[in-house]
Each structure stands twice: as structure tokens, then as C-alpha cells.
Interface confidence: low
């Protein structure tokens, strides 16, 4: 706490300016008024305080609102908001989403900061739901952001703003978290046509079921090996050696160089030796000629 | 070096079908990542966009030309073409053939253009 | 359709000086806007995307501001190859519905 000292004479600070730099700490107590800061906050970042006189501007700021800032004066805290603790932030009703843009450039280039977190958790549960403009912002800041939701918080997350997600924001997500993504994008992109589809698509395709690859497959789309190597095994497995092959297109050849990894190596296993043979591809490990496939699943489920 | 080059009458009767060639040499036609699409310029205008082709023949069109307009591409001759039917004195202008990506709607790469005038 | 409104038609600005062009959509277009630069006789060429990012080989004196539904180009030292006709374009509509503004004419005071 800084002591409590009268004023010098000629020294009441009438603005923010540059002239403050120059006050020491117990004079910026003493002189500036807590109101008229919060009024001039937008002049704080252009004039180069220490990090010592920024902690004097922040308890003057704390003091005039225990309850937490207003907005208006948190759209212009500048620099000041790497001052913050996740306490602090707690306090705040952020509703703006240029004020959240204003925050994040502060923090722009650096990972996300607990305070950071906190400021995009009161962000979005004040708003509801994460929709488009809000996901667009986060994004472009935080391009892993979207991955680092629980698939519980991805639950709150509408289809309509799947339009903002860009393939490398989910770069990073996990495989529940894409079961969560894929059903609300195919229903974002359900009025496309077959080629923008996949396009758009393509990304979310580590949460499809077998039926939508199968779908996928008739309709000339040309899967890559990389999304196919992200598909789930589960719903890989039951795909023929046809289905395999349109899905893939002139990208099945990619199939020999993938034969040991997951989920190849274990849809190769499932497959009819003859059948692997038909792509001229040298696939070696199917079921071997004249051998009686047993689907164990369905035997479970009769029984 | 990427090049398109546009090919067609340069004069069209009114009421008749505009068609235009447009030929990708120095890359691929068949590339997932771009689309194809056709832009026109009036004599002394601004710029239109009339219509994009993906490789595998699906099309999107400029909704106040769409019920007169055709893009279709021919991956195996590495060209898109464009069809403009009854047409009038308005479709007069230079039309430009250019790649966009299929993740924007920009257009990076452009062809030089051809004129097609539209008289009797 | 989305409109976009560009401003001034006609810049008269002297070589060596900044020149500043707008572009106005008619409802937002986020980020999604194109700056293309048409010399006589030539097709256009594309300079600035997603508002603010260069295009390969455009030189670092072409910058770009903006969001929403009010742009700017900004050309900070007129050289003599600059003076032509730009056009901006939005890609945010979906489906495709691409609009250009009227163009821009820059020439030499």
C-alpha cells in the first residue's frame, strides 16, 4: 500500500500527460485524481510509464471501483491489463467484443496468460453461447483456442459458427473434441454442394461416423492421406477395399507408404487379401484367402 | 509461370450464346486448391464477377446472370469454358478468365482479357 | 447483393506524396476485402487480401486498414507505375456473390 501524502503545491495533476512520468510513486497517489484517470484511461498507453508507476495508476483505479472497472474504462486499460490478476478480471462484465479485441492485442504474440483465459471465459459466458464474430476474434489471436475447450464447453458452440473455424484452429483438437465439432459443421455446410463441402468438411472429418465416409466416397471428393490418417479407426474399419479407393482417388497410392500406421494398418487387417490386390498397391496382412470373416460385433449383439 | 489464356468470337449477334475458353498452361487445372472463374469488364466500367468452376465441374454463378450462364471445365484439355446465352448489347465488355483460391474469394492470378462486342 | 462504394472516382495526387483510397461495403464484409491495381490494357492485379496482407511481390509502400464496412488503401510514396485505377472486392457473402467497387482513378497532379 502506498502512503497516503498530501500533494505538493503546483503539482495536482489537471490531465494524463507526459509530464507525469516524472512524478514519483507517492506523488501520482497524491496528485491524480482516481475519476479523472479513469476518464483520460486512453492516454495511459501512449505515455511511457514504469511498471512501478502502472502498479500506483492500477490501485488508484481499485480503489475507485472495488466492485470491478466499468467498461469504459476496460476497453482502454492498454498495457495496464497485463497488471491484472485472473482476480481482478472476475470482477469484470466484459459484453463488447471490441473491448475483448483491445485486451487481446495487449497480449498479441504471446501464449495465453491466465489472465487472458479468465478475461475469454467472462467474455463468453456473459454472451451465452461462442458465437461467430466472438470465435472469428479468438481464433485469429489464439488459433489453438478452440481446441483447448472442453468438449462440453464445444457443446454451447452453435453451427453457425463453425463458419469461422479455419483448419489450423483445429490443428490441435483430439478426437472427442472433433466428435463434438463434426455433426454442428455438417449441419453449418448441409446447403453446399459436393466439392465446397468437402472443402469445408475436410477439417471435422476426425469426428465422422462410417455411413458419412461412405457417403464421401461416392461422391468424388479426393481425400488427401493426411485427413485420412486423422479419420477415427472405428469408422474406418468397416470401409471396403471400393469404398476405400474412391474416397482416396488418385491419393490411394499414398496407402503403401501408410500400411504400418493407425488406422491403415488396421483397416489392411480387415480386409480380404484379394481384395487389398485389386489396388496393385502391394498391401500385404489381409485376411488370407478362404478364411471365414466373423463379424464379432454383431455376434455380441444377437447374443 | 502460371498462364491463362481466353479464346472465343469477338463478336457475337445479339440474342445468340457467348462462348469463351479459358486454357491453365504452367499448372495444374485439376489442383483442389483453386477455383476457376470468369470476370467482364464494360467498355470504360467496373468490374463484374460472373461465375466460378471447381476441377470436378461443380460451378457457383453471379445470381443476376445465373439463368443465362454455363461454366463447365475439361481437366483432360486443362480448360474451363463459359456460355452466355441471349444475349444483348449490356454483355458487351472484356472478359478475363483468373484462378481464385478455394478458400477466398479473391483472384490472384488473371489472363489478359478478350473483347467480345455484342452487335448486329 | 453487398455494395461497395469507392471514394474519391478521381485522386490527383503529385509523385512522391501518400495517396489515400477508400471503400465502403454496404453491410459488413468482416475482413474478406481485395484491393486490385488495372494499368490501360491490362488485366487487374491482385494487391492487397484479407484487408491488410500484401500479395507476393507487391512492394511494402501499398498497406491496407480496416474491418467491417469501411476500408482504406493507403500508398505511402507515389511512384510513377502507381498511377492507374483500383478497384477493391469483397469475398464474404456466401454462396459466391463477389462485388468490386466502381474503381478508383489515381493520376499525376
Known amino acids: 500500500e502506498v502512503e497516503k501524502t498530501a500533494c505538493p503545491s503546483g503539482k495536482k495533476a489537471r490531465e494524463i500527460d507526459e509530464s507525469l512520468i516524472f512524478y514519483k510513486k507517492w506523488e501520482l497517489e497524491a496528485c491524480v485524481d482516481a475519476a479523472l484517470l479513469a476518464t483520460q484511461m486512453d492516454r495511459v498507453n501512449a505515455i511511457p510509464f514504469t511498471y512501478e508507476q502502472l502498479d500506483v495508476l492500477k490501485h488508484k483505479l481499485d480503489e475507485l471501483y472495488p466492485q470491478g472497472y466499468p467498461e469504459s474504462v476496460i476497453q482502454h486499460l492498454g498495457y495496464l491489463f497485463l497488471k491484472m490478476s485472473p482476480e481482478d478480471i472476475r470482477k469484470w462484465n466484459v459484453t463488447s467484443l471490441e473491448t475483448l479485441k483491445a485486451l487481446l492485442e495487449v497480449n498479441k504474440g504471446h501464449e495465453m496468460s491466465p489472465q487472458v483465459a479468465t478475461l475469454i471465459d467472462r467474455f463468453v459466458k456473459g454472451r451465452g453461447q461462442l458465437d461467430k464474430d466472438t470465435l472469428d476474434t479468438l481464433t485469429a489471436f489464439y488459433p489453438g483456442y478452440l481446441c483447448s475447450l472442453s468438449p462440453e464447453e464445444l457443446s454451447s458452440v452453435p453451427p453457425s459458427s463453425i463458419w469461422a473455424v479455419r483448419p489450423q484452429d483445429l490443428d490441435t483438437c483430439d478426437p472427442r473434441q472433433l466428435d463434438v465439432l463434426y455433426p454442428k459443421a455438417r449441419l453449418a455446410f448441409q446447403n453446399m454442394n459436393g466439392s465446397e463441402y468437402f472443402v469445408k468438411i475436410q477439417s471435422f472429418l476426425g469426428g465422422a461416423p462410417t455411413e458419412d465416409l461412405k457417403a464421401l466416397s461416392q461422391q468424388n471428393v479426393s481425400m488427401d492421406l493426411a485427413t485420412f490418417m486423422k479419420l477415427r479407426t472405428d469408422a474406418v474399419l468397416p470401409l471396403t477395399v471400393a469404398e476405400v479407393q474412391k474416397l482416396l482417388g488418385p491419393h490411394v497410392e499414398g496407402l503403401k507408404a501408410e500400411e504400418r500406421h493407425r488406422p491403415v494398418r488396421d483397416w489392411i487387417l480387415r480386409q480380404r487379401q484379394d481384395d487389398l490386390d485389386t489396388l496393385g498397391l502391394g498391401l500385404q496382412g489381409g485376411i488370407p484367402n478362404g478364411y471365414l470373416v466373423l463379424d464379432l460385433s454383431m455376434q455380441e449383439a444377437l447374443s | 509461370q502460371l498462364q491463362l489464356q481466353e479464346s472465343g468470337p469477338g463478336l457475337v449477334k445479339p440474342s445468340e450464346t457467348l462462348s469463351l475458353t479459358c486454357t491453365v498452361s504452367?499448372?495444374?487445372?485439376?489442383?483442389?486448391?483453386?477455383?476457376w472463374g470468369w470476370i467482364r469488364q464494360p467498355p470504360g466500367k467496373g468490374l463484374e464477377w460472373i461465375g466460378s468452376v471447381y476441377y470436378s465441374g461443380s460451378a457457383f454463378y453471379s445470381p443476376s446472370l445465373k439463368s443465362r450462364l454455363q461454366i463447365s471445365v475439361d481437366t483432360s484439355k486443362k480448360q474451363f469454358s463459359l456460355k452466355l446465352s441471349s444475349v444483348t448489347a449490356a454483355d458487351t465488355a472484356v472478359y478475363y478468365c483468373?484462378?481464385?483460391?478455394?478458400?477466398?474469394?479473391?483472384?490472384?492470378?488473371w489472363g489478359q482479357g478478350t473483347l467480345v462486342t455484342v452487335s448486329s | 447483393e453487398i455494395v461497395m462504394t469507392q471514394s474519391p472516382a478521381t485522386l490527383s495526387v503529385s509523385p512522391g506524396e501518400r495517396a489515400t483510397l477508400s471503400c465502403r461495403a454496404s453491410?459488413?464484409?468482416?475482413?474478406?476485402l481485395a484491393w486490385y491495381l488495372q494499368k490501360p490494357g491490362q488485366a487487374p492485379r491482385l494487391l492487397i487480401y484479407?484487408?491488410?496482407t500484401r500479395a507476393t511481390g507487391i512492394p511494402a509502400r501499398f498497406s491496407g486498414s480496416g474491418s467491417g464496412t469501411e476500408f482504406t488503401l493507403t500508398i505511402s510514396s507515389l511512384q510513377s507505375e502507381d498511377f492507374a485505377v483500383y478497384y477493391c472486392q469483397q469475398y464474404n457473402t456466401w454462396p459466391p456473390e463477389y462485388t468490386f467497387g466502381q474503381g478508383t482513378k489515381l493520376e499525376i497532379k
Open positions: 453491410q459488413s464484409v468482416s475482413s474478406n
Open positions: 484479407g484487408t491488410s
Open positions: 483468373a484462378r481464385r483460391p478455394y478458400k477466398s474469394g479473391l483472384f490472384d492470378f
Open positions: 504452367g499448372g495444374s487445372i485439376s489442383s483442389s486448391s483453386y477455383y
